[in-house]
Interface confidence: medium
């Protein structure tokens, strides 16, 4: 057992058929010693008397708010919250397996600079009675600090007969530095609570792995006289790291047909301009990446050729 | 070639080169995100490789005000990768391929050092750690580990040479 | 300077009761969980029973069946446990404990001040 916050503690169970559970034992907090009585959640059947209640917590049944009282006035509560473990593997049914890039995959981050701030999202089919607690450090045996935000919805889909919900939050490196060769991985803790179901996802990265830089800005085309020609120029995006001398990205540059099954011509270059052939009904579209370190590809910034 | 006493390195030529060293540290393990070495308790040996900190003036006002502190840095992290790269951790079984890009990679390492120390001028290096894996497996994910680590630090590398050029040639 | 020491261990004979201490110093023991956890001859350290710093939730081990209590008193930074109707299978050194962490404590990281352990043996 283990304090999640104030009077909020965590049972942990092997969960399986016939589990002994944990017996755990509540102990009013109060000076008083007779008149108690303890009920259970919005119950008001008496579950025991006296200053201790044992419990044997096996099943979601006996979690919950635990309350002793004396002569009808409350004198404290505890809330048992239960985090199963089945074949020695923590449960997570709360949220969804993202499955990218890998299996086993609940919390996505990403970065759109060296900065240090950094954002996390995870999904679930959850829509009510859910709670989570996001914390994050850098290095866990020294850990030094990383500030998150609170969680919030961020989005809504439908997914055939299911809605599902998207959480994100946003967090910062407390003492960032954009130039160093990160030695030691950011951690990030998600606390789930569904009802009285506990549960905790965890993420280990470098910022330089999660990089993902917003799309070039200010695509343009210029045509070139006598010529089906044109220069296409862009700039680095604003949220970008900078000095660009030192945080370089480079680019890559894609003329796309109206059709998916035609043929795309490709430019790669770390310059913000370059010279493409545009077809009719064609588009050209920009992507970006760090020039130094292969991380993720921007979204496409695009423009039509005509 | 860098001069001693502290004067400015061939940013150019470094530019050139550290750039070719991600281009080939990426060609040797160019599987991002798909297999975490972090998990396979990787303390006792990545822990041990030079990392160009905070403190090491690598930053653009680091550079500005004294480039000698950070490129003292990235000459010993590029001695100690060449040493790896040498050892029998790279050359032992599984033999690498004779197309394997880890030999250039090994000779642009040694190729970069020379640029940033000339003859007769001793910046001190860092012990190579005795790592010396028995099992061939043991060594395959050693190799992967320690050019994930390259990647990181030649990139760092290559921002530093980048804007050195852009910024403080002469 | 952190310090536990624990005192009360000894030879006892078995349906036998004995009552353990452990005086903390050094840290702010009204904040951390403390535990009581003994290790046998031959075996691996045993959780016996955590308690919070309000002593007011805890939870035994399989193996004391409400043979034991354990309780604190924060005001002399102390720790105790009540072993009542000893088994020879209960000798070990008993030692307390902190986890590394005081309010948040996940014991993940195991635990971050110990005591030198009191020997209880229980033999007739």
């Known amino acids: 057992i283990w304090e999640l916050k104030k009077d909020v503690y965590v049972v942990e169970l092997d969960w399986y058929p016939d589990a002994p559970g944990e017996m755990v034992v509540l102990t009013c907090d109060t000076p008083e010693e007779d008149g108690i009585t303890w009920t259970l959640d919005q119950s008001s059947e008496v579950l025991g008397s006296g200053k201790t209640l044992t419990i044997q917590v096996k099943e979601f049944g006996d979690a919950g708010q635990y309350t002793c009282h004396k002569g009808g006035e409350v004198l404290s509560h505890s809330l048992l919250l239960l985090h199963k473990k089945e074949d020695g593997i923590w449960s997570t049914d709360i949220l969804k397996d993202q499955k990218e890039p890998k299996n086993k995959t609940f919390l996505r981050c990403e970065a759109k600079n060296y900065s240090g701030r950094f954002t996390c999202w995870w999904l679930t089919t959850i829509s009510t009675d859910l709670t989570f607690s996001v914390k994050s450090s850098r290095g866990s045996s020294d850990p030094q600090g990383v500030t998150c935000g609170a969680a919030t919805l961020s989005a809504e889909r439908v997914r055939g007969d299911n809605k599902e919900y998207e959480y994100s939050v946003e967090c910062q490196e407390d003492s960032a530095c954009p130039a160093a060769e990160e030695s030691l991985p950011i951690e990030v803790m998600v606390d789930a609570v569904h009802k009285l179901k506990y549960e905790n996802y965890t993420s280990s990265f470098f910022i330089r792995d999660i990089i993902k830089p917003d799309p070039p800005k200010n695509l343009q085309l210029k045509p070139l006289k006598n010529s089906r020609q044109v220069e296409v120029s862009w700039e680095y995006p604003d949220t970008w790291s900078t000095p660009h001398s030192y945080f370089s990205l480079t680019f890559c540059v894609q003329v796309q047909g109206k059709s998916k099954r035609e043929k795309k011509d490709r430019v790669f270059t770390d310059k913000t301009s370059a010279t493409v052939i545009c077809r009719k009904n064609a588009s050209i579209s920009v992507r970006a990446q760090d020039r130094y370190y292969s991380s993720s590809w921007s979204e496409w910034a695009s423009v039509p050729c005509s | 070639r860098a001069v001693p006493g502290g004067s400015s390195p061939a940013w150019t030529q470094c530019q050139q080169l550290s750039q070719k060293l991600c281009t080939l540290a990426w060609s040797a393990h160019p599987l991002v995100g798909h297999m975490d070495l972090r998990e396979e308790g990787d303390e006792e040996t990545t822990n041990d490789v030079p990392h160009i900190q905070c403190g090491d003036g690598c930053d653009p006002q680091g550079l500005r005000d004294n480039s000698q502190f950070c490129l003292q840095r990235i000459h010993q992290g590029l001695i100690f990768y060449e040493k790896l790269l040498g050892s029998d951790i790279f050359t032992g079984e599984p033999s690498l391929l004779p197309d394997s890009p880890v030999g250039q990679l090994h000779a642009s390492l040694l190729g970069l050092s020379q640029l940033l120390q000339p003859e007769g001028h001793h910046w001190e290096t860092q012990q190579i750690p005795s790592l010396s894996p028995s099992q061939p497996w043991q060594r395959l994910l050693l190799r992967f580990k320690i050019l994930r680590s390259l990647q990181a630090f030649v990139a760092v590398a290559a921002r530093v040479f980048a804007h050195g050029a852009a910024t403080l040639s002469p | 300077e952190v310090q536990l020491v624990e005192s009360g261990g000894g030879l006892v004979q078995p349906g036998g009761s004995l009552r353990l201490s452990c005086a903390a110093s050094?840290?702010?023991?009204?904040?951390?969980?403390m535990y009581w956890v003994r290790q046998a001859p031959g075996k691996g350290l045993e959780r016996v029973a955590p308690l919070n710093p309000g002593g007011t939730i805890t939870l035994y081990a399989d193996f004391v069946k409400s043979r034991f209590t354990i309780s604190r008193d924060n005001a002399k930074n102390t720790v105790y446990l009540q072993m009542n109707s000893l088994k020879p299978e209960d000798t070990a050194v008993y030692v307390c404990a902190a986890p590394s962490g005081t309010l948040y404590t996940r014991n993940k990281s195991g635990y971050i001040y110990w005591g030198q352990g009191t020997q209880v043996t229980v033999s007739s």
């Open positions: 050094g840290f702010t023991f009204s904040n951390y969980w």
